[in-house]
């Protein structure tokens, strides 16, 4: 006679919360005589899931009619799956015995794992801004997914990044898992308009990955380049000092004019022009009257950008010897 085989064709069954799960089990022989029971887990602590002869199993139904004499299909359907239902299910053949039935053979088992989608990835940037050529870290987090296998990729402006580290927790068996990945990005001066994207692919997403993004504008500080020029005015006794602050980001910038070390004007950048790369330019003017100056004037422009240390740029306005003579005459 043919030896009994217990066939559980699925090694793994992925089921979403609330769905029904069908656990398949067929036998190759009607002998020996005795019932087929379903258990979750192995060993003495295993949990009885279904016994046709006795017990109450309201969420379990059989796929075939087990009362038929030649039935060889012992598949069951469990309704309204919850996270507590995860585990490995075994169909087990018992041989009729007295006073008790004796376990004869077990199927290989079907692992039921919850199929849960990962949450939308959340990307967070560094706590403080950094300047171009420096490296900043971005973190991507997603949670609540199952099974554990997941793929995460990083992109900057659509180009894949390679410098990142990813962890999936917990390491062992769990109802659901979370992923955390940190990517390192080297900032370029034109990255104000750049974007980093974290892409998560999972079996539950049917090939349509989830994405989270962060703007590098939140992470970058582009310090200004400074240029000071002077132009004599038509009147002859006035000089127009032009101070150009170029290619800075973010836009919070304060400019202080000092004449021989004394503050003569403080401005906050307002009417800015925006460059194509997202940085800003600003021009400030100061009209200096040289007619009442006896000595050379040291004009200093102090720029404080985004709470950083002030940067100074000075210009010496030379008063002509003729003016010096006139000034000294005026003091007698």
């Amino acid at each position: 006679e043919e030896e009994l085989q217990m066939i559980q064709p699925e090694k793994l069954l992925l089921v979403a919360v609330g769905e029904s799960a069908t656990l398949n089990c067929t036998v190759t022989s009607l002998l020996p005589v005795g019932p087929v029971l379903w258990f979750r887990g192995v060993g003495p602590g295993r949990e009885l899931i279904y016994n046709q002869k006795e017990g109450h199993f309201p969420r379990v139904t059989t796929v075939s009619d087990l009362t038929k004499r030649n039935n060889m299909d012992f598949s069951i359907r469990i309704s309204s799956i919850t996270p507590a239902d995860a585990g490995t299910y075994y169909c087990v053949k018992f041989r009729k015995g007295s006073p008790e039935n004796v376990e004869f053979k077990s199927g290989p088992g079907t692992e039921m794992a919850l199929r849960a989608k990962p949450s939308a990835p959340v990307v967070s940037g560094p706590a403080a801004r950094a300047t171009p050529e420096h490296t900043v870290s971005f973190t991507c987090k997603s949670h609540g997914f199952s099974p554990r296998d997941i793929t995460l990729k990083w992109f900057k402006n659509g180009n894949e990044l390679s410098d990142f580290q990813t962890n999936v927790d917990p390491a062992g068996q769990s109802v659901s898992y979370s992923i955390r990945s940190t990517a390192r990005v080297v900032l370029a001066p034109w990255d104000v308009r750049s974007q980093v994207t974290c892409e998560v692919a999972h079996v539950t997403l049917q090939g349509d990955p989830l994405r989270g993004t962060a703007n590098l504008s939140e992470a970058i500080r582009v310090p200004p380049t400074l240029e000071v020029t002077q132009q004599p005015m038509r009147a002859g006794n006035q000089v127009n000092i032009t101070y150009q602050v170029r290619n800075f980001y973010p836009q919070n910038l304060q400019l202080t004019w000092l004449e021989n070390g004394n503050v003569c004007r403080t401005e906050t950048a307002s009417t800015l022009t925006e460059n194509k790369d997202g940085t800003y330019n600003w021009t400030s003017w100061l009209l200096v009257n040289t007619s009442d100056q006896r000595d050379d004037v040291v004009l200093t422009c102090q720029v404080k950008h985004d709470g950083q240390l002030a940067v100074n740029k000075s210009l010496v306005l030379e008063v002509s010897a003729h003016q010096k003579d006139q000034s000294s005459d005026a003091t007698h």
Epitope: N157, W190, V192, R193, Q195, E274, K276, D277, G278
Partner: antibody, heavy 126, light 106 residues
Framework: QVQLVQSGAEVKKPGASVKVSCKAS????????IHWVRQAPGQGLEWMGW????????NYAQKFQGRVTMTRDTSINTAYMELNRLRSDDTAVFYC???????????????????WGQGTMVTVSS | DIQMTQSPSTLSASVGDRVTITCRAS??????LAWYQQKPGKAPKLLIY???SLETGVPSRFSGSGSGTEFTLTISSLQPDDFATYYC????????FGQGTKLEIK
């Protein structure tokens, strides 16, 4: 799909102003600069300037500075181009166009224009 | 300002012909050049960017080459749909277009 839809044709008198709209759909409006290009009848294409819909920042071609104003309304994904003090030689088709990429891949940050509106004919005549 | 000069201004050709349009820049623009096709009453359509990259959905009979100051647009086998005006555009320093080349049926 990604598209830019412009307002209808306009007839204006010399000295008047015209405001052309350009409604974006199918993509993130604030992610890409919008440019304006004009084309006089039987002539070539002339770049007028751009607007960054995210910040509202603009840059105008020297020729149009002081006469053109580009604005946007992010709540309705629409960019506008207003040209003042119209002359008869401003008679042209005005196009809005979107850049191919929404980021900078090089210092100048300039890029080609791959999505165009259908054009708005503006006729300036007394 | 960078000037762009296209030649020829008008080109007569037949279906199946191989045609070449040239664009010259007044100074080096590296590879920052695009080619557009425009039909009467329609908006320009991007064909080639970065001198030689084919825009998505554009037939492979269109190709671009060149760098620095000399650029060409080639149509390997002219189709009835290709009769139009073609413009080159530099985007190395702001934006300037060539004056256009009208491709007409011989």
């Amino acid at each position: 799909q990604v598209q830019l839809v412009q307002s209808g044709a306009e007839v204006k008198k010399p000295g008047a102003s015209v405001k052309v709209s350009c409604k974006a759909s199918g993509y993130t409006f604030t992610g890409y600069h919008i440019h304006w290009v004009r084309q006089a009848p039987g002539q070539g294409l002339e770049w007028m300037g751009w607007i960054n819909p995210n910040s509202g920042g603009t840059n105008y071609a020297q020729k149009f500075q002081g006469r053109v104003t580009m604005t946007r309304d992010t709540s309705i994904n629409t960019a506008y181009m207003e040209l003042n003090r119209l002359r008869s030689d401003d008679t042209a088709v005005f196009y809005c166009a979107r850049e191919r990429v929404g980021y900078c891949s090089r210092p100048s940050c300039l890029d080609d224009l791959n999505i165009w509106g259908q054009g708005t004919m503006v006729t300036v005549s007394s | 300002d960078i000037q762009m000069t296209q030649s020829p201004s008008t080109l007569s050709a037949s279906v199946g012909d191989r045609v070449t349009i040239t664009c010259r820049a007044s100074q080096s623009i590296s590879s920052w050049l695009a080619w557009y096709q425009q039909k009467p009453g329609k908006a320009p359509k991007l064909l080639i960017y970065k001198a030689s990259s084919l825009e998505t959905g554009v037939p492979s009979r269109f190709s671009g080459s060149g760098s620095g100051t000399e650029f060409t647009l080639t149509i390997s086998s002219l189709q009835p749909d290709d009769f139009a005006t073609y413009y080159c555009q530099q985007y190395d320093s702001y934006y300037t277009f060539g004056q256009g080349t009208k491709l007409e049926i011989k």
